[in-house]
């Protein structure tokens, strides 16, 4: 009975997902058979989090839309390793969208997912970021300094990566 | 007072260069990003290239891109358009413009009086 | 790329009274409360002149008969009251996503 209504549970939080998400992949967490954590596919996994590069080119708010549809945020960086993992799945020869923007031009970085934004948890290339006009941020890679961040025109289309929540059931 | 001067239109043949220039005063010039737009003849307004206050950024349609280099000297207050391999469809006059940011968008705010470029075998 | 479609092409009307420019977006160009559509004047033989950034908020020194509304993918320039000095060709132009692109203008006349 209680194997039954935990599989119930179960199919019926993968309804919720199936819309946007209609493959999932899942893993078990630690050794208890009943708790599973799951990425949609092919998304990747890392910590708590699921990841999706998107190769189509849009604007800022357009690649936040695009994460949002998909019940996710443009990725939000919250550590060095995070972004050493982000980092194995981007082409070198691209820029790609994060969660953090300065709409107002003053220099106030937010995430998109109201982390506050700390200083000491930054990757700029150095120099950046250098323009007010400049409100969205992109990591890409540079020769001298690897992968780091730049800030550009919100407008201008580039590649994203989304972030979202595993999904537990 | 922003005052923007475009210069450097002219007639050429399919296939030549010209190169536009617009000097700019009345404003901080080296802090502000810049574009061009160009009108054909009796026709709308299309957007022509973007470069940002440093000159590291550049930004163009897919119908000049690879054909066009957008770029400016900070020191003389000037922005210029390298136009290669000019085509019929080219032939527009040529307006220069400040962009002002507005959250995640722009507006291109004060325009120049534009310099016509001919194009014509 | 997103396109602007603007209607009517052409617009006859009396002094002192309304003109209305109607501009369609292929696709939202809305984001977080804010609609990144401009609209633009060009008088003959002179470049454009901004009067509306945001969808609605009025650039300065801008006469306040010129009003502009709507969100999402439908949008409104509105001439409250006509003035000879207001004949000109208005452009409705998206600055959400390069390539920027404008509307075809809509041409307007005193009938």
């Known amino acids: 009975n209680f194997m039954y209504s935990k599989t119930v549970k179960r199919l019926s939080k993968l309804r919720e997902y199936q819309q946007y998400h209609p493959s999932l992949t899942c893993v078990m967490e630690g050794k208890d058979i009943e708790d599973w954590s799951c990425c949609p596919t092919p998304w990747t996994s890392f910590q708590s989090s699921c990841y999706f590069i998107s190769t189509g080119m849009q604007s800022w708010t357009k690649s936040q839309k695009n994460c949002s549809v998909m019940g996710a945020d443009l990725v939000v960086i919250n550590t060095r390793e995070e972004q050493d993992f982000i980092i194995q799945n981007l082409k070198r020869n691209s820029s790609y969208f994060l969660g953090l923007s300065d709409p107002g031009g003053r220099r106030h970085w937010q995430w998109v997912d109201q982390t506050p934004y700390n200083e000491n948890v930054t990757f700029w290339h150095s120099g950046e970021p250098n323009n007010l006009d400049e409100r969205c941020a992109i990591i890409n890679f540079r020769s001298s300094e690897e992968w780091g961040w730049n800030d550009i025109h919100c407008h201008v289309p580039q590649k994203s990566i989304c972030k979202m929540k595993k999904i537990y059931i | 007072e922003v005052q923007l001067l475009e210069s450097g239109g002219g007639l050429v043949q399919p296939g030549g260069s010209l190169r536009l220039s617009c000097a700019a005063s009345g404003f901080t010039f080296s802090t502000y990003t810049m574009s061009w737009v160009r009108q054909a003849p009796g026709k709308g307004l299309e957007w022509v290239s973007t470069?940002?206050?440093?000159?590291?950024?550049?930004y163009y349609p897919d119908s000049v891109k690879g054909r066009f280099t957008i770029s400016r000297d900070n020191s003389k207050n000037t922005l210029y358009l390298q136009m290669n391999s000019l085509r019929a469809e080219d032939t527009a006059v040529y307006y220069c413009?400040?962009?002002?940011?507005?959250?995640?968008?722009?507006?291109?705010?004060?325009w120049g009086q534009g310099t016509t470029v001919t194009v014509s075998s | 790329d997103i396109v602007m479609t603007q209607s009517p092409d052409s617009l006859a009307v009396s002094l002192g009274e309304r003109a209305t420019i109607n501009c369609k977006a292929s696709?939202?160009?809305?984001?977080?409360?804010?609609?990144?559509v401009n609209w633009y004047q060009q008088k003959p033989g002179q470049p454009p002149k901004l009067l509306i950034y945001?969808?609605?908020n009025l650039e300065s020194g801008v006469p306040d008969r010129f009003s502009g509304s709507g969100s999402g993918t439908d949008f409104t320039l509105t001439i409250s009251s006509l003035q000879a000095e207001d004949v000109a060709v208005y452009y409705c132009q998206q600055s959400d996503e390069d390539p920027w692109t404008f509307g075809g203008g809509t041409k307007v006349e005193i009938k």
């Open positions: 470069i940002n206050s440093g000159g590291d950024n550049t």
């Open positions: 945001g969808a609605s």
């Open positions: 696709q939202s160009v809305d984001y977080d409360g804010n609609s990144y």
């Open positions: 413009a400040t962009y002002r940011p507005y959250y995640y968008g722009s507006v291109l705010d004060y």
